[in-house]
C-alpha cells in the first residue's frame, strides 16, 4: 500500500514564535520507530542537509519532513514575528477540534487587557484572558487577531497582533466514490466504495459512511463500512451516485463528487427451446415442460411459447432470469406439433428454432371380428380374423390367438387394423382373441367364440329286429347314423313317404326310432340327417312283415 505520511510536530507547540526564538521540529512516522534511517527535511521545498529526526529552526517558512517508512508530511508554516504582540495557535489542529489561541506579548508581564477577534469581531467572553478556546474549527479562511495594552513607562499603548490563519489540518480526506464499474452489465453485481483517509494522528476518530443514488439513500443509511455491495444492477439503477463521510460525533461531514453510473443492457441472444422429456417424444397423459433459455441477455426478459397453427401464445413469463419453463399438464394427441419460443429484453423478440413434439397414444382395447363366407363357418371356409384398435399411434403390432396358441402377428404401419387368414378344419372351433401393442403396453381383446360346423355325411339306416325275420308284433328299432357332422343332428325317419318322427342327437352314435310291427309296416324305410348345413338322405331299406309264420319274414 501507500506509505503513511510523516507527521511534523512543534516544540513548543505554537506555529508562531518571536523572532530570535528557537522552535524544535520533530519528524515522526506512525509505522516505524524513530531510529530507523535518515530523516529528510525540507524548508520551502528545499532539501536541508540535516538528517536528524529533530531539528532547531529560527527561520520562518513552510517545513516538511520524510522518513524511510513514510511519505512526505504536510507542510507546517512556522512564523517568526518581529512584532511586539503575536497571536499563537496550538499545532497541530484538525477540523472539528477545539483550538487554543494565546495572545502573547514580547514582554508578556507588561501586557494586559488582551482581547481576541475573529474576522474583525470580538469573540465573546474573550476579554483579558491569557488564552481562549475556539470550538470546532473548520478549514475556512477565518482571520484571528488580538489586541492588548503594553505598559510603556507610565503609558498604556494599545497594540494589535498580525492576523493569524489557523492551519487546520484535514481530519480525513475528501471522499471519492469508487464503483467496481461505471458501466455495469445488467444483472451483474457492483461494489461501491466511499474512499477517504483518516489522519494517522487521529486513529481513534470513528467515521461513518452513507451512499446515495440521486437523492435516495442506498442500503441502511449511515454505516461504519465504506463499502456497499449491490448483488445485481438493473437499468433502473442507472443514475448519479455519491457518498458522504462524517465523524460519528457529526462534527465533520464531507461529500464526494457525483459519479454517473449507466447500467448496460445485454440484448438476448441464442434463444433455445428444450423439451422434457428429452427428444419431445411423449405418451398421452404425460406432463411436458417447455424450457426456453438464452445464452446471453440481461435484465427483465419476456419469454413466450408458441405452437404452429395457433395464433395466441401458449404462455408468457417476464422474469429476471436466463431461462423460463412452461408446464403443459396431461398432454393430448392435439398437443403434437411444432413449437418454438421467443425471448425479448430490448425491442424485438428473438426466436428459437422449431422443435417437433410427438404425442404417442397407447392402444385401446382391440376388437376382434370374424369375416367368413357364411354365418355358420364350415370346414374348408377361409376365415379372416380382423383385429383393430380404434386408438393408438402406429405402428401397431397385432397378435392373433386360438385358445392360448399364437397363430401369428401382423403389423399396421400406419394404424388401423390387421387381418389374419385361416383355412378352417374341424379343430379350429374354440375361443379366439387378439392383442394390440405399439410399444406403450399391449391391450387384449375380448374372446370371440367360433364354431366350425361339419356338414353331415350320408346317414346309414339299420333295421334291428329280435329275429332274422320281422313278424307282426316285433319291436323294430330303426337306427340312423351319420359318421360325420357337427351336432346337434336332427334325424328324420320315413316309411314310404310318411314321416314316422324325428330325434335330435347331441352326441355321436346316431338316433333310434322304435316301431311295434303290423303287416302294414312292410315297405321301404329311409332316414335323413340334418344339422342345418344341408340334409342328407340314407339309402332305402325294404322291410317285409309277415303274420305268424317267421320263415316267410326277412330283412333285405
Amino acid at each position: 500500500g501507500v506509505a503513511p505520511k510523516a507527521v511534523l510536530l512543534l516544540n513548543p507547540p505554537w506555529s508562531t514564535a518571536f523572532k530570535g526564538e528557537k522552535v524544535a521540529l520533530i519528524c515522526s512516522s506512525i509505522s516505524h520507530s524513530l531510529a530507523q534511517g535518515d530523516t529528510y527535511w525540507y524548508h520551502d521545498e528545499k532539501l536541508l542537509k540535516i538528517k536528524h529526526d529533530k531539528i532547531q529552526i529560527t527561520e520562518p517558512g513552510n517545513y516538511q519532513c520524510k522518513t524511510r517508512g513514510s511519505s512526505l508530511s504536510d507542510a507546517v508554516h512556522v512564523e517568526f514575528s518581529p512584532d511586539w504582540l503575536i497571536l499563537q495557535a496550538l499545532h497541530p489542529v484538525f477540523e472539528g477540534d477545539n483550538v487554543i489561541l494565546r495572545c502573547q506579548g514580547k514582554d508578556n508581564k507588561n501586557t494586559h487587557q488582551k482581547v481576541y477577534y475573529k474576522d474583525g469581531k470580538q469573540l465573546p467572553n474573550s476579554y483579558n484572558l491569557e488564552k481562549i478556546t475556539v470550538n470546532s474549527v473548520s478549514r475556512d479562511n477565518s482571520k484571528y487577531h488580538c489586541t492588548a495594552y503594553r505598559k510603556f513607562y507610565i503609558l498604556d499603548i494599545e497594540v494589535t497582533s498580525k492576523p493569524l490563519n489557523i492551519q487546520v489540518q484535514e481530519l480525513f480526506l475528501h471522499p471519492v466514490l469508487r464503483a467496481s464499474s461505471s458501466t455495469p452489465i445488467e444483472g451483474s453485481p457492483m461494489t461501491l466504495t466511499c474512499e477517504t483517509q483518516l489522519s494517522p494522528q487521529r486513529p481513534d476518530v470513528q467515521l461513518q459512511f452513507s451512499l446515495f443514488r440521486d437523492s435516495q439513500t442506498l442500503g441502511l443509511g449511515w454505516s461504519r463500512s465504506p463499502r456497499l455491495q449491490i448483488p445485481a444492477m438493473w437499468t433502473e439503477d442507472s443514475g448519479s451516485y455519491w457518498c458522504e463521510v462524517e465523524t460519528v460525533t457529526h462534527s465533520i461531514k464531507k461529500r464526494s463528487l457525483r459519479s454517473q453510473i449507466r447500467v448496460q443492457r445485454v440484448p438476448v441472444s441464442n434463444v433455445n427451446l428444450e423439451i422434457r422429456p428429452t427428444g419431445g417424444q411423449l405418451i398421452e397423459g404425460e406432463n411436458m415442460v417447455l424450457i426456453c433459455s438464452v445464452a446471453q441477455g440481461s435484465g427483465t426478459v419476456t419469454f413466450s411459447w408458441h405452437k404452429e397453427g395457433r395464433v395466441r401464445s401458449l404462455g408468457r413469463k417476464t422474469q429476471r432470469s436466463l431461462l423460463a419453463e412452461l408446464h403443459v399438464l396431461t398432454v393430448k394427441e392435439s398437443d403434437a406439433g411444432r413449437y418454438y419460443c421467443a425471448a425479448d429484453n430490448v425491442h424485438s423478440p428473438i426466436l428459437s428454432t422449431w422443435i417437433r413434439v410427438t404425442v404417442r397414444i397407447p392402444v385401446s382395447h382391440p376388437v376382434l371380428t370374424f369375416r367368413a363366407p357364411r354365418a355358420h363357418t364350415v370346414v374348408g371356409d377361409l376365415l379372416e380374423l380382423h383385429c383393430e384398435s380404434l386408438r393408438g399411434s402406429p405402428p401397431i403390432l397385432y397378435r392373433f390367438y386360438h385358445e392360448d396358441v399364437t397363430l401369428g402377428n401382423s403389423s399396421a404401419p400406419s394404424g388401423g387394423g390387421a387381418s389374419f387368414n385361416l383355412s378352417l378344419t374341424a379343430e379350429h372351433s374354440g375361443n379366439y382373441s387378439c392383442d394390440a401393442d405399439n410399444g406403450l403396453g399391449a391391450q387384449h381383446s375380448h374372446g370371440v367364440s367360433l364354431r366350425v360346423t361339419v356338414p353331415v355325411s350320408r346317414p346309414v339306416l339299420t333295421l334291428r329286429a329280435p329275429g332274422a325275420q320281422a313278424v307282426v308284433g316285433d319291436l323294430l328299432e330303426l337306427h340312423c347314423e351319420s359318421l360325420r357332422g357337427s351336432f346337434p343332428i336332427l334325424y328324420w325317419f320315413y316309411h314310404e313317404d310318411d314321416t314316422l318322427g324325428n330325434i335330435s342327437a347331441h352326441s355321436g352314435g346316431g338316433a333310434s326310432f322304435n316301431l311295434s310291427l303290423t303287416t302294414e309296416h312292410s315297405g321301404n324305410y329311409s332316414c335323413e340327417a340334418d344339422n342345418g348345413l344341408g340334409a342328407q338322405h340314407s339309402k332305402v331299406v325294404t322291410l317285409n312283415v309277415t303274420g305268424t309264420s317267421r320263415n316267410r319274414t326277412g330283412l333285405t
Epitope: H402, E403, D404, V405, T406, S423, E427, R484
Partner: antibody
Framework: EVQLQQSGPELWKPGASVKMSCKAS????????MKWVKQSHGKSLEWIGD????????FYNQKFKGKATLTVDKSTSTAYMELNSLTTEDSAVYYC?????????WGQGTTLTVSS | DIVLTQSPANLSVIPGDSVSLSCRAS??????LHWYQQKSQESPRLLIK???QSMSGTPSRFTGSGSGTDFTLTINTVETEDFGMYFC??????????FGGGTKLEIK
C-alpha cells in the same frame, strides 16, 4: 377308429428322391391337418411340416424347406411326403400324424435308409 | 425358436415308485405344452394336452402341471408298461412346433 397307415421301408442311394405315403381312415380326411415328423435313430422328434388337406396349404419347418414336399390326394384320403437329394443324414423313421396343435394320432412310421 | 429342455435325460425307477419329469421352455409358452409316450419300436402316443388335460385312454396315474416356462409330468406309482421315452412338445407359435430331447424312463 382313426388309423394312419404308412408305406413300407425304403432303401435309397444318396442323391435319389423318395415319396412315402400315409393313408387315413376312420375320420373325414379333409377335417384335420396332417403332420410329418422325423425321428433319427436314438434321437428326439423333429417336426417337418403340416398340410391342410382341404386346400393343400402347407407349412414347413425352415430346416426342411427345399428338402420335403407335402401333398394330399383327397379322393384316396392319402397324404404324401417327398424327400429329395437324399443324404445319409436323411436316414430316419418318418411319421405322419393327425392334429392341429398337437399330434393326436400317429402312423406306424416309415423307415428310410440312405446308403451308398 | 422356442427350445424345450427335458430333464433328466435318463431316469431309473422301481415299479411302484412315483416320478416327475421336467420340461423347461426357453420363453413363456403359457399352457401350450403336450406330453407323449413312446415305447420301444412303437409310435409316440399323446398322453396330456395343453399342460394338464388328460386324453381319453390316458391312465389316471399320469398328471401334467405347469404354465409359462416350467412343466412337469408326474407318474404316480409307475407300472412296468410305463417304461419308455417321454417327449414334451410346444405349440405356442402356430405353425412352428418343437419337441424336447426326451427323458428315458427305465427299470432299475
Amino acid at each position: 377308429e382313426v388309423q394312419l397307415q404308412q408305406s413300407g421301408p425304403e432303401l435309397w442311394k444318396p442323391g435319389a428322391s423318395v415319396k412315402m405315403s400315409c393313408k387315413a381312415s376312420g375320420y373325414t380326411f379333409t377335417d384335420y391337418y396332417m403332420k410329418w415328423v422325423k425321428q433319427s435313430h436314438g434321437k428326439s422328434l423333429e417336426w417337418i411340416g403340416d398340410i391342410n388337406p382341404n386346400n393343400g396349404e402347407t407349412f414347413y419347418n425352415q430346416k426342411f424347406k427345399g428338402k420335403a414336399t407335402l401333398t394330399v390326394d383327397k379322393s384316396t384320403s392319402t397324404a404324401y411326403m417327398e424327400l429329395n437329394s437324399l443324404t445319409t443324414e436323411d436316414s430316419a423313421v418318418y411319421y405322419c400324424a393327425r392334429g392341429l396343435y398337437r399330434f393326436d394320432y400317429w402312423g406306424q412310421g416309415t423307415t428310410l435308409t440312405v446308403s451308398s | 425358436d422356442i427350445v424345450l429342455t427335458q430333464s433328466p435325460a435318463n431316469l431309473s425307477v422301481i415299479p411302484g415308485d412315483s416320478v416327475s419329469l421336467s420340461c423347461r421352455a426357453s420363453q413363456n409358452i403359457r399352457n401350450n405344452l403336450h406330453w407323449y409316450q413312446q415305447k420301444s419300436q412303437e409310435s409316440p402316443r399323446l398322453l396330456i394336452k395343453f399342460a394338464s388335460q388328460s386324453m381319453s385312454g390316458t391312465p389316471s396315474r399320469f398328471t401334467g402341471s405347469g404354465s409359462g416356462t416350467d412343466f412337469t409330468l408326474t407318474i404316480n406309482t409307475v407300472e412296468t408298461e410305463d417304461f419308455g421315452m417321454y417327449f414334451c412338445q410346444q405349440s405356442n407359435n402356430w405353425p412352428q412346433y418343437t419337441f424336447g430331447g426326451g427323458t428315458k424312463l427305465e427299470i432299475k
